[in-house]
Interface confidence: low
């Protein structure tokens, strides 16, 4: 998706709904694309992204991607439609209110990704094992 803060606003009298017809407004996410990061060996990190954007589409969720290779560490923050893969991975945890990082297999780098569906939830990315996504207290009940 393109950063929504550069888009023209659309004025109409309709609220977009999800597949079940539930009322949804576009979400707020940190949206700094790819930036260098100092986040390393921590239980959780803040994104240090100063741009909060209204996602382009109501169904989009917040995504954060943490990558480490021999040269640097980057953190990517975006909005993305969970029905579509991102970096070739499905957003399995899109319904979570917290951004719980999960490692993905990528050759030549360490690659973690998380997605979540509460406003600005990709501002705080969580690596700690104590945050287990099977814990119902961390799950936002969404019926897609």
């Amino acid at each position: 998706t393109i950063p929504p803060h550069v888009q023209k606003s659309v004025n109409n009298d309709m609220i977009v709904t999800d597949n079940n017809g539930a009322v949804k407004f576009p979400q707020l996410c940190k949206f700094c694309d790819v930036r260098f990061s100092t986040c390393d060996n921590q239980k959780s990190c803040m994104s240090n992204c100063s741009i909060t954007s209204i996602c382009e589409k109501p169904q989009e969720v917040c995504v954060a991607v943490w990558r480490k290779n021999d040269e640097n560490i980057t953190l990517e923050t975006v909005c993305h439609d969970p029905k579509l893969p991102y970096h070739d991975f499905i957003l399995e945890d899109a319904a979570s209110p917290k951004c719980i990082m999960k490692e993905k297999k990528k050759p030549g780098e360490t690659f973690f990704m998380c997605s979540c569906s509460s406003d600005e939830c990709n501002d705080n990315i969580i690596f700690s094992e104590e945050y287990n996504t099977s814990n119902p207290d961390l799950l936002l009940v969404i019926f897609q």
Epitope: M14, N20, V23, K24, F25, P26, S118, L140, I142, F143
Partner: antibody, heavy 121, light 107 residues
Framework: QVQLVESGGGLVQPGGSLRLSCAVS????????MSWVRQAPGKGLEWVSA????????HNTDSVKGRFSISRDNSKNTLYLQMNSLRAEDTAVYFC??????????????WGQGTLVTVSS | DIQMTQSPSSLSASVGDRVTITCRAS??????LNWYQQKPGKAPKLLIY???SLQSGVPSRFSGSGSGTDFTLTISSLQPEDFATYYC?????????FGQGTKVEIK
């Protein structure tokens, strides 16, 4: 603590206009969708209008379309409801509420204390 | 519009009683169902959202269940501060609609 304080209610003649305000404090107003919900005397609750966090999307219940307009000023942490062509059946306590928001949490919470609008000649 | 019907419209109960209020939607609303409590002259207060999720700060004696068209709010042991009117609300489709309310009175 979170506070929503409505003002602007009062007695108005049929066909008249009123502008309600809801001053918000205790949470980051610009991040959240907001709604107006009304309650006629001795009756139940009726959702009236909603506006997205940025203010670029609005939605009204059919009975007020073309007469009521919801807006917000994120720099002032204030929600508004402009009510024109008022009718006797618009008489109610009008509540502002945080909600009708993204992420599946489609509920109203918290609410203001309400402001009474009476339409009568 | 989706119609929400609560029953009973009022009930009398004593402190310590188990109280059950039902809400029926005119069509399936999945689990997009919220419950509110309102006391006279006050604003409504959210109790339960998404049919069964307890809102932060709400006592655990309140619980919600159901999906589709039939929903239940249960107060396991009625307390003096629970005497109020309770409303269900669907957020499955616009406009969001409320039930007519159930008034819980002291027996």
């Amino acid at each position: 603590q979170v506070q929503l304080v409505e003002s602007g209610g009062g007695l108005v003649q049929p066909g008249g206009s009123l502008r309600l305000s809801c001053a918000v404090s205790g949470f980051t107003f610009r991040r959240y969708a907001m709604s107006w919900v009304r309650q006629a005397p001795g009756k139940g609750l009726e959702w009236v209008s909603a506006i997205s966090a940025s203010g670029d999307r609005t939605h009204n219940t059919d009975s007020v379309k073309g007469r009521f307009s919801i807006s917000r000023d994120n720099s002032k942490n204030t929600l508004y409801l402009q009510m024109n062509s008022l009718r006797a059946e618009d008489t109610a306590v009008y509540f502002c509420a945080k909600g009708l928001a993204a992420s599946g949490k489609n509920f109203f919470d918290p609410w203001g204390q309400g402001t009474l609008v009476t339409v009568s000649s | 519009d989706i119609q929400m019907t609560q029953s009973p419209s009022s009930l009398s109960a004593s402190v310590g009683d188990r109280v059950t209020i039902t809400c029926r939607a005119s069509q399936s609303i999945s689990s997009y169902l919220n419950w509110y409590q309102q006391k006279p002259g006050k604003a409504p207060k959210l109790l339960i959202y998404a049919a069964s999720s307890l809102q932060s700060g709400v006592p655990s004696r309140f619980s919600g269940s159901g999906s589709g068209t039939d929903f239940t709010l249960t107060i396991s042991s009625l307390q003096p501060e629970d005497f109020a009117t309770y409303y269900c609300q669907q957020s499955y489709s616009t406009p969001p609609t409320f039930g007519q309310g159930t008034k819980v009175e002291i027996k």
